[in-house]
């Protein structure tokens, strides 16, 4: 059986199914008794009561409080209620990112060793007697294996297998398709010492900016003790007293490895900062990763067309 | 593989100037763009200056502007930093490598004290 939903504070991407399964659910014979209630309280409302009357994506179960789908007007605090026992949880709905296969702030990262076992299984047991197919993609291009009812990749690591795999699960229910992502960031590191340095997030990133306002943009990575990073733009890096690089933060792994961070503050934008990269380089021995900032004027990111956005 | 050897640091006043030179004692960097690292005592190695493959395009930090200058010989496969009005906050081991691009192997540094 699946687990109950233990965490209190909970990340969901609008559009996709999702539930949440109180945790005195093996109290089966007082359920069948008992009176149970769930409620939602959000900002305006304050302990509404739930029941399939109240949203036709709503779906209540013995244990269970399903969303067909989860939109973003369910943000809020859920309660369920059994005589004296309360559950609550915080639920937090994020958009969907309409330009890529898998929204980046729902992306679970993991670091392999090359040469290492590596293994990538496609699996949702809640939905799993629901789910019509699977199919497992890597950095949004899907990729062809032969089971396509749970997809799986067992290998020994190399240096390529880098990227992001999302299990994408099309599902079907009263009538309608739906997909649940899962998506995993995968780090290849180098087996004993060295790993290879990798910046965090995407490669290329618009940010929306006002004129005359200051901005920080934050360049993060996975590297050594001996690797740098370093911020670079334009020809001649003097020109532009409002550039600042601030001192360069960097936190110790538990695999002792080091997590750097370092900001480049640009103070009172002008039109000279717009639509210029800033580039940001880890670099090792063994290569380099760099990552591109390009500040956008706020009333023109609706131009910016889809593909951008990709990695 | 290249071997990276800086000389020039030493002990100096507040005030004074050195210059510190960068050389290849195995291999060849002259294709490379270059640059200065520092790293004080318990902080990060920074990035001071750089200098392109062909001496033509020049960057600082914001903390050097004005008081350091990058240059490079590729007939003897050498970089220079020249330090003017040096500070005390300059103290530091001074590195060269390449950047941009995957990094030479580390030299030993040069030592550079400023005192007050």
């Known amino acids: 059986a699946e687990s109950c939903t233990s965490r209190p504070h909970i990340t969901v991407v609008e559009g996709e199914p999702f539930y949440l399964k109180h945790c005195s659910c093996s109290l089966a014979h007082e359920i069948e008794t008992t009176t149970k209630s769930w409620y939602k309280s959000s900002g305006s409302q304050e302990h509404v009561e739930l029941n399939p009357r109240s949203s036709s994506r709503i779906a209540l179960h013995d244990c269970v409080l399903e969303f067909w789908p989860v939109e973003l007007n369910d943000t809020g605090s859920y309660f369920f209620q059994m005589k004296n026992y309360t559950q609550k949880w915080k639920l937090n709905v994020i958009r969907r990112n309409k330009h890529s296969c898998f929204t980046e702030r729902q992306v679970t990262s993991k670091i392999v060793e090359v040469k290492k076992f590596f293994q990538i299984t496609c699996e949702n047991s809640y939905y799993q007697t629901l789910v019509n197919s699977t199919s497992l993609y890597k950095n949004c291009k899907k990729l062809l294996l032969e089971n396509n009812k749970n997809p799986t990749i067992k290998k020994n690591a190399e240096f390529e297998d880098q990227g992001y795999y999302s299990c994408v699960h099309f599902l079907h229910h009263n009538g309608k398709l739906f997909n649940i992502t899962k998506t995993f960031n995968i780090t290849i590191v180098e087996d004993r010492s060295n790993i290879v340095p990798v910046l965090l997030g995407p490669k290329l990133n618009h940010v929306a900016v006002e004129l005359g306002k200051n901005v920080r943009l934050n360049c993060s990575a996975l590297l050594n003790e001996e690797d740098v990073i370093y911020w670079m733009f334009g020809e001649e890096n003097g020109s532009d007293p409002n550039i600042h690089e601030e001192k360069e933060m960097r936190i110790m792994t538990p695999e002792g490895k080091w997590h750097a961070s370092k900001v480049l503050r640009i103070e009172n934008i002008g039109e000279s900062n717009l639509n210029v990269l800033y580039n940001c380089t880890v670099a090792s021995t063994g290569g380099t990763d760099t990552k591109s900032f390009i500040l956008v004027r706020k009333a023109d990111m609706a131009d910016i067309p889809g593909h951008v956005f990709t990695r | 593989e290249v071997q990276l050897v800086e000389s020039g640091g030493g002990l100096v006043q507040a005030g004074g100037s050195l210059r510190l030179s960068c050389a290849a004692s195995?291999?060849?960097?002259?294709?490379?763009?270059m640059g200065w690292f520092r790293r004080a005592p318990g902080e990060q190695r920074e990035l001071v200056a750089r200098i392109s493959s062909g001496g033509s395009t020049t960057n600082y930090a914001d903390s050097v502007k004005g008081r350091f200058t990058i240059s490079r010989d590729n007939a003897k496969n050498t970089v220079y930093l020249q330090m003017n009005s040096l500070k005390p906050e300059d103290t530091a081991v001074y590195y060269c490598n390449r950047v941009p691009g995957s990094l030479h192997y580390w030299g030993q540094g040069t030592q550079v004290t400023v005192s007050s």
């Open positions: 195995r291999g060849t960097f002259t294709g490379d763009p």
